[in-house]
Interface confidence: low
């Protein structure tokens, strides 16, 4: 069943799956001035066994302007920081995706993929939230939101997550302000657990984040 | 893979009905396109049918159109024809197939874009 809405938006923070359960879709966008090939396919679709998920299909683009870019590659290191995505240090490894039974990893880039990623998630799907650089989280609630089927409708649970500038005081009674890391960021944006429900595991937020939205749009 | 095992077809009479079905079995085929294709003795195996991986679009040989009709069950792993108002010209051997590209924005009335096939299953209309 695919949630009908997008994640909730947080000010000043954005979200990310760490996973993508069996049944979501990705839209095979390409970027301007590249186009789907012709009888390629709109999605990907996360699919699988008991055993084994995976993303069925690949996304291709080929020019606009002409008809013979098909080739599947890995973008090269230019072609990627075109993507939207902000890189975050962390001390450790984020959930290994591949050990989620009826989940999938983080599909590759494709050539000439378009720079924001439009997922179409299913109930049960749980996305995690980080302030974005620049902001430290000020509630230490659960920092994630899932979508959950109630009444036979689809709603995203609210995370509890406040992200506030660096420059602002304002603090929880006791709470010191944060050291920044070698990177120059906050220690807040950098080492936020969270625990996951979903996989009953402690994890730290993932070491890629997007800063694009994804959007549930079904056509 | 994508496994399929068609059933339902037999002898009928001219203006009769059947309805064949098409079992598939393999972690993909919700993701493709579906067709019927037969092949009449003598014949080049011709299209007759198709539905989409969403079962938004549907296609139809201009012979069937009116006549027959395709639906699939996601749930079920099922694809079935309805064929309605029998033609002796009906006769042959009906196959179900699945298009060879994933979530296939396109409905493709050629075979040589269906990767996979079952064993066919024969339909004969007496007149």
């Known amino acids: 069943e695919l949630c009908d809405d997008d994640p909730p938006e947080i000010p000043h923070a954005t979200f990310k799956a760490m996973a993508y359960k069996e049944g979501t879709m990705l839209n095979c966008e390409c970027k301007r001035g590249f186009r789907r090939i012709k009888s390629g396919s709109l999605y990907m679709l996360c699919t699988g066994n008991s055993s084994h998920s995976s993303w069925d299909n690949q996304c291709q683009c080929t020019s606009s302007a002409t008809r013979n870019t098909t080739k599947q590659v890995t973008p090269q290191p230019e072609e990627q920081k075109e993507r939207k995505t902000t890189e975050m240090q962390s001390p450790m490894q984020p959930v290994d995706q591949a050990s989620l039974p009826g989940h999938c990893r983080e599909p590759p880039p494709w050539e000439n993929e378009a720079t924001e990623r439009i997922y179409h998630f299913v109930v049960g799907q749980m996305v995690y939230y980080q302030c974005v650089q620049g902001y430290r989280a000020l509630h230490r609630g659960p920092a994630e939101s899932v979508c959950k089927m109630t009444h036979g409708k689809t709603r995203w649970t609210q995370p509890q997550l406040i992200c506030t500038g660096e420059m602002e005081t304002s603090q929880f009674p006791g709470e010191e302000k944060p050291q920044a890391s070698p990177e120059g960021r906050p220690e807040s944006e950098t080492s936020c657990l969270v625990t996951t429900t979903d996989f009953q595991i402690q994890t730290e937020m993932a070491a890629t984040m997007e800063t694009s939205i994804f959007t549930t749009e079904y056509q | 893979q994508v496994q399929l095992v068609e059933s339902g077809g037999g002898l009928v009479q001219a203006g009769g009905s059947l309805r064949l079905s098409c079992a598939a079995s393999g972690g993909t085929f919700r993701t493709r396109n579906m067709g019927w294709f037969r092949r009449a003795p003598g014949k080049e195996r011709e299209f007759v049918a198709a539905?989409?991986?969403?079962?938004?679009?549907?296609l139809y040989a201009g012979s069937v159109k009116g006549r027959f009709t395709i639906s699939r069950d996601n749930g079920r792993n099922m694809v079935y024809l309805q064929m309605n108002s029998l033609k002796p010209e009906d006769t042959a051997v009906y196959y179900c197939a699945a298009d060879n590209i994933p979530l296939s924005s396109d409905m493709r009335p050629t075979a040589t874009e269906y990767d996979y096939w079952g064993q066919g299953t024969q339909v004969t209309v007496s007149s």
């Open positions: 539905v989409s991986w969403n079962v938004d679009n549907k």
